[in-house]
Interface confidence: medium
Amino acid sequence: LRLLDFPAPVCAQEGLSCRVKNSTCLDDSWIHPRNLTPSSPKDLQIQLHFAHTQQGDLFPVAHIEWTLQTDASILYLEGAELSVLQLNTNERLCVRFEFLSKLRHHHRRWRFTFSHFVVDPDQEYEVTVHHLPKPIPDGDPNHQSKNFLVPDCEHARMKVTTPCMSSGSLWDPNITVETLEAHQLRVSFTLWNESTHYQILLTSFPHMENHSCFEHMHHIPAPRPEEFHQRSNVTLTLRNLKGCCRHQVQIQPFFSSCLNDCLRHSATVSCPEMPDTPEPIPDYMPLWEPRSGSSDYKDDDDKGSSHHHHHH
């Protein structure tokens, strides 16, 4: 979690003098409670916007917007604390709006915005706006919170952001997998425009099981410039194990921008259809039924969200 360093955030507006300050997320009013405190924010909205840095990078940012309730408590409103918590790491970042003048009227609804929190693809955040001073112990809460889920790099608008491009989001390998005779798989994919090596990771599973029955890793050396954007064809030999028939092929690139941490793409080949034979009646009743019916072939990312389907 970090803040954009450019342009400098602004919270001043007509009728209000205000400055944005870094915050420790522990406002003084927690330690020294005040008697009279303002009401909570109204209509908190968080949206995904994008910001260009001075260096020309494009980053996803959380655009935070809220309004004030039209009550007399604005007379005691001294500012606001904005907090963003990344849920998977518990990392928190805060800023404070410090009002340098008093709000004295509601001629128009007061609206505040802040768009300087840089967020990461495929992460969930809790965004909280606290009005200051914070309430006395056991006082009514004067904050509003909302969760905010950032799309992953597969999303059209996220794909061109710097963090996504750095992890290889623009590379579409268009993987095809073909089952050959004599226990072989032919894997074909499109190389990216970088002289870097790739790894093909093959994991095979029995029908309807998630414990692997065969694993194999194949190294593909860095292509020459004339091979960029060309198809690479690799034939993998499978172990002759009856029933070890569902194969997941994962391609891991090692681009200079992401090294060992690049987005992987995978394709799955399902087991061939079984002929209809009467099943023996089990002498026990299973507690649950495994779900069946996967597609013949799918090309998807390493999180398993299907982003291409090809049937053959």
Partner: antibody, heavy 131, light 107 residues
């Protein structure tokens, strides 16, 4: 209320460059993507490309070699240039704004959706390619 | 490119009928889909966003459903002003693509 207005010549000669401008009124061009879409006579809709207010562009690969989209934030305008036109480029050309995200809430708990899509359109301008 | 298909390509219906139009994507697009109505000589107008959310100002007789690859637009009780062509649009991955359209005319 944001409104979009396309402008430019209605007749372009084959092999020349088609140039159109979209003027945004009633709102800022900032923080949105701005799209060009076209519709050939009696045909469906085809997305040409888009531009972010900062100048970052995305183009339809089928037209990429001939398309340039640019933005002028000071005038609240964005423009389309399509080079080497043929009669197949005769169409109604629309500009459209890519909508902001919409958040809405399900029963008991929230559900947040990332939404982009064209929510505000210009009325369209007809461009005929003919000698 | 993601190919969007619509069915039927045209249909004839009467005022008061329930009308259902289906849109299919050639690969999963989550809920990144909108439905648009277009009348002759006019720009498309958005009816539904995020696959199932009703655009502000659009009558509640329009509804959308679906996720992934299959989506549906339903008009619960067709009105005279609903005779038009309807398009779906995926905005999940570039290039954004429209369905070929479904023309709804008077029976």
């Amino acid at each position: 209320q944001v409104q979009l207005q396309e402008s430019g010549p209605g007749l372009v000669k084959p092999s020349e460059t088609l140039s159109l401008t979209c003027t945004v009124s009633g709102g800022s061009i900032s923080n949105y993507y701005w799209n060009w879409i076209r519709q050939s006579p009696g045909k469906g809709l085809e997305w040409i490309g888009d531009i972010y207010y900062s100048g970052s562009t995305n183009y339809n690969p089928s037209l990429k070699s001939r398309v340039t989209i640019s933005v002028d934030t000071s005038k609240n305008q964005f423009s389309l240039k399509l080079s080497s036109v043929t009669t197949a480029d005769t169409a109604v050309y629309y500009c459209a704004r890519d909508g902001e995200l919409a958040n809405y809430y399900g029963s008991g708990s929230y559900q947040f959706y990332y939404y982009y899509g064209m929510d505000v359109w210009g009325q369209g301008t007809t461009v005929t390619v003919s000698s | 490119d993601i190919l969007m298909t619509q069915s039927p390509s045209s249909l004839s219906a009467s005022v008061g009928d329930r009308v259902t139009i289906t849109c299919r994507a050639s690969q999963g697009i989550r809920n990144d889909l909108g439905w648009y109505q277009q009348k002759p000589g006019k720009a498309p107008k958005r009816l539904i966003y995020a696959a199932s959310s009703l655009q502000s100002g659009v009558p509640s007789r329009f509804s959308g459903s679906g996720s992934g690859t299959e989506f549906t637009l339903t008009i619960s009780s067709l009105q005279p002003e609903d005779f038009a062509t309807y398009y779906c649009l995926q905005h999940n991955s570039n290039p954004f693509t429209f369905g070929p359209g479904t023309k709804v005319d008077i029976k």
